[in-house]
């Protein structure tokens, strides 16, 4: 080994070197949180970039750049260091027009902490391993969601557009003429029944066990879907989103109540199956895979 390489190895394995890098990263993070940094912080930026460059040079000199098994670029953690340095010089010395977008990559410096703190490295390693292992579970999850989204599409397509419509019109008004003129919130509130404090018209259905309209109102299929049009089973993608919402239990009881009111209480069976399979089984399966991966990484 050349004297330069020997010195580099000595620096690299020294605990103070790790401490210096860790303190630099943490200080850098503190500086990044500043709202309106003073002018002198520019020089501090250069210092940080200098320290990161020195760290990488030491690693390259000690281990080699990319030829060989244990060289600098063969370690994925060093890819992060390399990217951080490249972007530091790019944003500083190359005029690339909209630099603010590139400056976003400075945040990657905070991720350098992971490679320095051993505990964090284990957790992130487990996370990456779990993602690899999760591929099969993810395929199963997407498949199950797709199947139920297709069932939901067949059962509830268009149902959430059912609304309670006022039973008194002007002489020249018909259902279609109103449908063609409905635009503002005011128009909707004029013709449809709203529960107090509700932002959507009261849902209803045409089956005997679905929600019925109050006196003076009739159930029709007009206008948009609830929640600004985001809640529906009208297309596969919207149905898939609704199923994902059920699986993650994201305000799912509202979707459940809306659908049952529009389609009928019988369809609660669909929701029971989806919640049991999607929410209880698949979610816990995902957690089990993550836990297994973490256990393996620890061993």
């Amino acid at each position: 080994f050349s004297p330069l390489r020997r010195i580099s190895i000595k620096i690299l394995v020294h605990s103070l070197f790790s401490m210096l890098i860790m303190c630099t990263i943490l200080t850098n993070c503190i500086f990044m949180t500043m709202n309106n940094p003073p002018d002198w912080t520019k020089n501090v930026e250069y210092t940080f970039t200098g320290i990161y460059t020195f760290e990488s040079l030491v690693k390259i000199l000690a281990r080699g750049f990319c030829v060989g098994e244990f060289t600098f670029l063969r370690d994925p953690w060093n890819w992060l260091d390399f990217v951080v340095i490249v972007f530091a010089y790019l944003t500083e010395f190359v005029n690339l027009g909209n630099v603010s977008a590139l400056r976003t990559f400075r945040v990657l410096r905070a991720l350098k902490t992971i490679s320095v703190i051993p505990g964090l490295k284990t957790i992130v390693g487990a996370l990456i391993q779990s993602v690899k292992k999760l591929s099969d579970v993810m395929i199963l999850t997407v498949f199950c969601l797709s199947v139920f989204a297709l069932i939901g599409l067949q059962l509830f397509m268009g149902n959430l557009k059912h609304k309670c419509f006022r039973n008194s019109l002007e002489n020249n008004e018909t259902l279609e003429s109103i449908m063609n003129t409905l635009e503002s919130e005011e128009d909707f509130r004029k013709y449809f029944y709203y529960l107090e404090g509700s932002k959507d018209a009261l849902l209803c259905g045409f089956s005997t066990d679905s929600g019925q309209c109050p006196e003076g109102y009739t159930c029709v299929k007009i206008g948009r879907n609830p929640d600004y049009g985001y809640t529906s089973f009208d297309t596969f993608s919207w149905a898939f989103l609704a199923l994902f919402r059920l699986m993650t239990q994201d305000y799912w009881e509202n979707l459940y109540q809306q659908t049952l009111r529009a389609a009928g209480k019988t369809y609660m069976i669909f929701f029971v199956v989806v919640i049991f399979l999607g929410s209880f089984y698949l979610i816990n399966l995902i957690l089990a895979v993550v836990a297994m991966a973490y256990e393996e990484q620890n061993q």
């Epitope: 259902l175 279609e176 159930c219």
Partner: nanobody
């Protein structure tokens, strides 16, 4: 194709009576907001004569108030227009309108569904 079956039109003398029927007997017709009678005289626009809402409340054009009566038989899914004291100006093609919801088998659809029309001629 959704079809409303209209009947009862014909030629009648001034002061006479006619009863028009509009049957939405097809299973496709689910629920109406209202079912009404409209008329169109030659060279004129289609205008409302009378309509009956699903709860039974009614609307009439000013020109027919007191002379015409609209009623419905929910069991038969039929709406009737009883026309008394007919005048020559009542001569027109009378259309039935189902304004409500139909079932296409796959989904529900709300809108206006018109009949073919039945001709009423009032002349001496």
């Amino acid at each position: 194709e959704v079809q409303l079956v209209e009947s009862g039109g014909g030629v009648v003398q001034p002061g006479g009576s006619l009863r028009l029927s509009c049957a939405a007997s097809s299973r496709q017709f689910i629920r109406d907001v209202f079912t009404g009678w409209y008329r169109q005289a030659p060279g004129k626009q289609r205008e409302l004569v009378a309509r009956i809402y699903n709860e039974g409340n009614t609307n009439y054009a000013d020109s027919v108030k007191g002379r015409f009566t609209i009623s419905r038989d929910n069991a038969k899914k039929t709406v009737y227009l009883q026309m008394n004291s007919l005048r020559p100006e009542d001569t027109a093609l009378y259309y039935c309108l189902f304004s409500g919801t139909i079932s296409t088998g796959r989904e529900y659809r709300s809108g206006d569904y018109w009949g073919q029309g039945t001709l009423v001629t009032v002349s001496s």
